[in-house]
Interface confidence: low
């Protein structure tokens, strides 16, 4: 009797997933001397162990504990940049501002960035055909649970002033259902975090509106204030100029509003 294979709604595991994770781990530990003690084979074994042979709709944070443990890493708690729906600019920013960190600048985030993975119940196979979609299939899938786990820990580690980059071109600039809105906001520690500063990134060149007055930003301010954390907001009208001024802060054009 041919085995029926579950067809999920989302794309399957990224091609060459094991090789990609291992290669990224090796590269990361070479670039970051403080992580050179990490055994990348053990990291891959722990990653694999989190989802292989498990039903891809029944993954828990516990499944990722061995990987979390191996990925233990110190990041400056006052140099954390969160982002929502604007990953590329956030990463361009930390590539220039080298002392600030997004989750994807940490080992665990770097390993999984832009990848998809899932297994099958009771077999050691990786499913390259399809994986569960968060909305259409189930939320407790390997990818969603991974990002929820690492995002919660990353937010919990933050201190002093935490920055978040938000996409001003979207209808919901702050989205309660995003990872930032559903996980990170609620795991900032009020006894450590003094201020959350939002950077709202404008899309259009002629867009001079004050997007800090947007109803969803006011909603974010309300959530943060109730958690006894101060809130501030800045419009970044010209993201291209913003990045240029981070690279060359002494440029005379960088004294005006960005």
């Amino acid at each position: 009797v041919p085995r029926w294979r579950q067809q999920w709604s989302g794309p399957g595991t990224t091609k060459r997933f094991p090789e990609t994770v291992l290669a990224r781990c090796v590269k990361y530990t070479e670039i970051h001397p403080e992580m050179r003690h990490v055994d990348c084979q053990s990291v891959w074994d722990a990653f694999k162990g989190a989802f292989i042979s498990k039903h891809p709709c029944n993954i828990t944070e516990e499944d990722y504990q061995p990987l979390m443990k191996l990925g233990t890493q110190t990041v400056p708690c006052n140099k954390i940049l969160l982002w929502s729906r604007i990953k590329d600019l956030a990463h361009q920013f930390t590539q220039v501002q080298r002392d600030m960190f997004t989750l994807e600048d940490t080992l665990l985030g770097y390993l999984a960035d832009d990848l998809t993975w899932c297994g099958e119940f009771n077999t050691s196979k990786i499913n390259y055909q399809s994986c569960p979609d968060w909305r259409k299939d189930c939320s407790n899938n390997p990818v969603s649970v991974f990002w929820k786990t690492v995002s919660r820990r990353f937010a919990e580690a933050a201190c002093d002033v935490v920055h978040v980059m938000l996409n001003g071109s979207r209808s919901k600039i702050f989205d309660k259902n995003s990872t930032f809105g559903s996980v990170e906001v609620h795991n900032l520690q009020p006894e450590k975090v003094q201020t959350l500063e939002a950077w709202v990134i404008h899309g259009g060149r002629e867009d001079s509106r004050d997007l800090c007055q947007d109803p969803t930003i006011k909603e974010l301010e309300s959530i943060i204030s109730k958690r006894n954390i101060q809130f501030s907001c800045k419009n970044i009208y010209r993201p291209d100029k913003f990045l240029q001024c981070v690279k060359n802060p002494e440029d005379s054009s960088c004294t005006s509003e960005i």
Epitope: H37, P66, M68, P76, F154, Q189
Partner: antibody
């Protein structure tokens, strides 16, 4: 708010055993290493070992391997350290301290538990 | 095990002075060094991590520097409440080890 609350002072006889607890709140207990540190009166700090509650992994300082047993109860978010075959050199203050995945160093400490071994 | 040596067991100072405490590792620990303050009857308190990063809520008069084997902890302008024992710690390899401590007192 992260808190580590240790059990109270202990006065025990030589040769006996004792179990010290460290009850945590305000963070994901399963996902951070819990460390134990010894401080003898007027002396410095000595790392005993650590436990990862998520999967029960334990790493001991070799100097304490035959003296100490670490454990953790995820249901109550509590870490434990048992010391056995006690002698006067075990008289000290014992601290629990956590280290999270992205947390810098030993950022939160318990208030300490004073152990006195005396006949 | 890596040995962390704090050369001074005691340092005498006065309010307003600049004071530096040194710590030497027996082998390269990159920047995996933290500094703690401990007052009598209290648990240690994290001040500096990763050699030079000030922990949240720590006044900016406390600074740390160094990498490799030589590390320095500095109080730029000593206050009365800074009287305590200061420990360095390396967490580059297991077991993590602490320096013997330097007690800061007033002249």
């Amino acid at each position: 708010q992260v808190q580590l609350q240790q059990s109270g002072p202990e006065l025990v006889r030589p040769g006996a055993s004792v179990k010290i607890s460290c009850k945590t709140s305000g963070y994901a207990f399963s996902g951070s290493w819990m460390n134990w540190v010894k401080q003898r009166p007027g002396q410095g700090l000595e790392w005993i070992g650590r436990i990862y509650p998520g999967d029960g992994d334990i790493i001991y300082n070799g100097n304490f391997r035959d003296k100490v047993t670490l454990s953790a109860d995820k249901s109550s978010n509590t870490a434990y350290m048992q010391l056995s075959s006690l002698t006067s050199v075990d008289s000290a203050v014992y601290f629990c301290s956590r280290w999270g995945t992205f947390t810098p160093s030993f950022d939160y400490w318990g208030q300490g538990t004073t152990l006195t071994v005396s006949s | 095990d890596i040995v962390m040596t704090q050369s001074h067991k005691f340092l005498s100072t006065s309010v307003g002075d600049r004071v530096s405490i040194t710590c030497k590792a027996s082998q390269d620990v990159v920047t995996a060094v933290a500094w703690f303050q401990q007052k009598p009857g209290q648990s240690p308190k994290l001040l500096i991590y990763s050699a030079s990063h000030r922990y949240t809520g720590v006044p900016d008069r406390f600074t740390g520097s160094g990498s490799g084997t030589d590390f320095t902890f500095t109080i730029i302008s000593v206050q009365a409440e800074d009287l305590a024992v200061y420990y360095c710690q390396q967490h580059y390899t297991t077991p993590t080890t602490f320096g013997g401590g330097t007690k800061l007192d007033f002249r």
